[in-house]
Interface confidence: low
């Protein structure tokens, strides 16, 4: 059984369904904007063929009007594109989503480079940000099993078009703050995290602001352990290393486990010219294991100082808990001091117990 199974992305966490057909969404766009209307199937299930209708007439796709089963895009919108839009089931003509679209004369994105110029009071909509789909933001607490993909959305509007930023537990949140990174989709006002792990738990706040004001929304993410599971090891760690004779090397291993993990670092050795025993088990020597004063953080790093040619070879990070074991391996290549560094093969071998 490969670790790939353990780390598969189980799927997207279910999103809050769209408004009831009776509810009409009021949307305001600026002239020249792209009008984007989204109508996901109710309950997340299949919804069959659909038709988009404006003011009672079926929309004909064109270069400017892009029609999809769950999405409608009207490019370079003008005043004439204002009206009542609905997405209906083709067979029953049941209204799945209903939108009231208003296209104003003012473009919705401010051109002010420095942000100093106040917008003139021309009577058009200028002002602080507001939520365009508040009913999509009702679910403040999202609980998903580990390995799911999570998406937080804060659809907003304002004039000038507001910016969106994200905080985790009150602090600026950027891609480098989590292994696996994040996807910020500014046009969709969303934050996406794939393959979530327990360390992703916390409060996520979207901050939407323009020069007229600021609004924010906080979501709480809880990541449930998929018990009973052996530890999950971060893909790609430890990574293969190439080092010059006499230099220092560090191997890293990131372990996720809800049950207390036990971490060991092993080096593969040969016994009588053989790498494996009669039962196929590799011969190894334990380089580092939990001691009275070692922390998990310390165990996640193996440091080799002043490496020699004897240090070259295969190294394994082995993590076990009450459920079972997982292990990842990487190779160390040691080069003579006068040779230039040569990149080792990037992909470390991956095993799972």
């Amino acid at each position: 059984e490969s670790l790939g199974t353990e780390q598969r992305v189980v799927g997207r966490a279910a999103e809050v369904p769209g408004p009831e057909p009776g509810q009409q969404e009021q949307l305001v766009f600026g002239s020249g904007d792209a009008v984007e209307l989204s109508c996901p199937p109710p309950g997340g299930g299949p919804m069959g063929p659909t038709v988009w209708v404006k003011d009672g007439t079926g929309l004909v796709p064109s270069e400017r009007v892009l029609v999809g089963p769950q999405r409608l895009q009207v490019l370079n919108a003008s005043h004439e594109d204002s009206g009542a839009y609905s997405c209906r089931q083709r067979l029953t003509q049941r209204v799945l989503c209903h939108f009231s679209v208003r296209v104003t004369d003012a473009p919705s994105s401010g051109d002010d480079e420095d942000g100093e110029d106040e917008a003139e009071d021309t009577g058009v909509d200028t002002g602080a940000p507001y939520w365009t789909r508040p009913e999509r933001m009702d679910k403040k607490l999202l609980a998903v099993p580990a390995a799911n993909t999570v998406r937080f959305r804060c659809p907003a509007a304002g004039n000038p078009t507001p910016s969106i930023s994200w905080l985790k537990n009150g602090r600026e949140f950027r891609g480098e703050h989590r292994i696996g990174g994040i996807k910020l989709r500014h046009q969709q006002w969303s934050l996406v995290m794939e393959s979530v792990v327990p360390s992703d738990r916390g409060n996520y706040t979207c901050v939407v602001e323009n020069k007229f004001g600021s609004i924010r929304q906080t979501y709480t993410l809880d990541v449930l352990e998929r018990s009973p599971h052996r530890p999950i090891l971060q893909a790609g760690l430890p990574a293969n290393q190439t080092a010059v004779l006499g230099s220092d090397v560090e191997f890293h291993c990131k372990v996720y486990s809800d049950a207390q993990p036990h971490i060991q670092w092993l080096k593969h050795v040969e016994v009588n010219g053989s790498k494996v025993g009669p039962d196929g088990t590799p011969y190894v020597t334990v380089l580092k294991t939990a001691g009275a004063n070692t922390t998990d953080k310390e165990l996640e790093v193996l440091s080799l100082h002043n490496v020699t040619f004897e240090d070259a070879g295969e190294y394994t990070c082995l993590a076990g808990n009450s459920i079972g074991f997982s292990h990842h391996s990487a190779w160390l290549v040691v080069l003579p001091a006068e040779e230039e560094l040569v990149e080792a093969d990037e992909a470390g071998s991956v095993y799972a117990g």
Partner: antibody, heavy 116, light 110 residues
Framework: EVQLLESGGGLVQPGGSLRLSCAAS????????MSWVRQAPGKGLEWVSG????????YYADSVKGRFTISRDNSKNTLYLQMNSLRAEDTAVYYC?????????WGQGTLVTVSS | QSVLTQPPSASGTPGQRVTISCSGS????????VYWYQQLPGTAPKLLIY???HRPSGVPDRFSGSKSGTSASLAISGLRSEDEADYYC???????????FGGGTKLTVL
């Protein structure tokens, strides 16, 4: 060996209260999500409530929201379920279970009977 | 009315292969791990299958789980008299923010 031992069940009148306890042993209690699951006589399993390790995030079934409170004391390795405003339909065997996304160990259960 | 749907009963003769189905939706089975539990008469439930198709140690390989889309199934091959029990499927439901079970299937070994 993992063991979960429930206690606190008994006969109570409608509108009354009861507090269930679950003593855990054989594993590091504070590292695990814990849940309560119940089973009415002759019926199927119904998840009641779950609590994340540090009591941070707590979940309840709609049928018990506002009436039941789950809590834990990691120093005592004990899980609790405070049940108020009990109704006849709360009559069931209440199991303590380890896990949140699934349950790998279960206690033997304690019977709660709500009757006048 | 259970969120996950199971047949109320199933039966088979010793040595036979029996399959129990469990259907749900995208917010539970479709996106989350499926678990199967066995409850012998008068005892607490016991974990049989976790994460769709994995067996905890101690569970015979006669028991296997599978999942496709929003449905899952438990297969028991080489049926034995001691397999007579109630079987439940379960999964986390992301819409309800809670765990859901099937109504249970009573397996009779004829």
């Amino acid at each position: 060996e993992v063991q979960l031992l429930e206690s606190g069940g008994g006969l109570v009148q409608p509108g009354g209260s009861l507090r269930l306890s679950c003593a855990a042993s054989g594993f590091t209690f504070s590292n695990y999500y814990m849940s309560w699951v119940r089973q009415a006589p002759g019926k199927g399993l119904e998840w009641v409530s779950g609590i994340y390790y540090g009591s941070g995030n707590i979940y309840y079934a709609d049928s018990v929201k506002g009436r039941f409170t789950i809590s834990r004391d990691n120093s005592k390795n004990t899980l609790y379920l405070q049940m108020n405003s009990l109704r006849a339909e709360d009559t069931a065997v209440y199991y303590c279970a380890r896990g949140g996304g699934g349950f790998d160990y279960w206690g033997q259960g304690t019977l709660v009977t709500v009757s006048s | 009315q259970s969120v996950l749907t199971q047949p109320p009963s199933a039966s088979g003769t010793p040595g036979q292969r029996v399959t129990i189905s469990c259907s749900g939706s995208s917010s539970n089975i479709g996106n989350n791990d499926v678990y199967w539990y066995q409850q012998l008469p008068g005892t607490a439930p016991k974990l049989l299958i976790y994460a769709d198709n994995h067996r905890p140690s101690g569970v015979p390989d006669r028991f296997s789980g599978s999942k496709s889309g929003t449905s899952a199934s438990l297969a028991i091959s080489g049926l034995r008299s001691e397999d007579e029990a109630d079987y439940y499927c379960g999964a986390w439901d992301a819409s309800l923010n809670g765990y859901v079970f099937g109504g249970g299937t009573k397996l009779t070994v004829l």
